[in-house]
């Protein structure tokens, strides 16, 4: 018996943890950290042999309505 959409997410991809606006969510470790601990990846020079790594960084998701902007994907996540 199918369980519905929830099972599509799988155990490896839980929903991002809601951080207070003062913090940011780190997708790599899957918890909130000081935003200064996150590093936006620098683009690789053109012609690099390996593809650019996916970033594990994401701005904070706010707790509660209207407390801050929703999390936006970084270029590396697109």
């Amino acid at each position: 018996m199918r369980r519905g959409p929830r099972s599509l997410r799988g155990r490896d991809a839980p929903a991002p943890t809601p951080c207070v606006p003062a913090e940011c969510f780190d997708l790599l470790v899957r918890h909130c950290v000081a935003c200064g601990l996150l590093r936006t990846p620098r683009p690789k020079p053109a012609g690099a042999s390996s593809p650019a790594p996916r970033t594990a960084l994401q701005p904070q998701e706010s707790v509660g309505a209207g407390a801050g902007e929703a999390a936006l994907p970084l270029p590396g996540l697109l």
Epitope: A22, E23, H31, C32, L37
Partner: antibody, heavy 118, light 113 residues
Framework: EVKLVESGGGLVQPGGSLSLSCAAS????????MSWVRQPPGKALEWLGF??????????EYSASVKGRFTISRDDSQSILYLQMNALRAEDSATYYC?????????WGQGTSVTVSS | DIVMSQSPSSLAVSIGEKITMSCKSN????????????LAWYQQKPGQSPKLLIY???TRGSGVPDRFTGSGSGTDFTLTISSVKAEDLAVYYC?????????FGAGTKLELK
Amino acid sequence: EVKLVESGGGLVQPGGSLSLSCAASGFTFTDYYMSWVRQPPGKALEWLGFIRNKANGYTTEYSASVKGRFTISRDDSQSILYLQMNALRAEDSATYYCAGYRNAMDYWGQGTSVTVSS
Amino acid sequence: DIVMSQSPSSLAVSIGEKITMSCKSNQSLLYSTNQKNYLAWYQQKPGQSPKLLIYWAFTRGSGVPDRFTGSGSGTDFTLTISSVKAEDLAVYYCQQYYIYPLTFGAGTKLELK
């Protein structure tokens, strides 16, 4: 009205322990991280650490000056924040404030005084 | 640790005067992804606890009068009071929350001339 009321301060000998409490009301306690900040007499503010909310697993961050000696915990059912202080030193003497942390330290208590002296 | 330096350490003012105070960090507090500066200002009146004035470097806290304005980006920040009132006499602290440990400046004390 937002209220944060600290208690438990007092005089303690070096090497001793003390537990501070902070009773919160007037805001959604579970939405906030809760922090402790201290201020020695006539000096600047010093952040000690904070505890995240249940949604973030009640994880904690501490300053190097208190890590391993102080422990922050919270009881969401009663909206109370705790600071357990062990191996106290003279330099821990200060007014201790609790603060609700969300956009920054949005709400502050009135403070409780701790004196470490023999 | 990020070091926050405030100047001047004290400021003698007259009521109605426009004043500015400075806060500098030894590394940038700007998170490029959301273009926010992780800097707050607090006011502490004599014998009282601190109160949040400004966060994100320029957003006023709840109930803070519009005579208080925060500005700056990166490493250099300013708090301006457009017309000082008697109730503004206090110590003003800046604080970074960009990285742990969260750190405060030593404060700027606003006193009467």
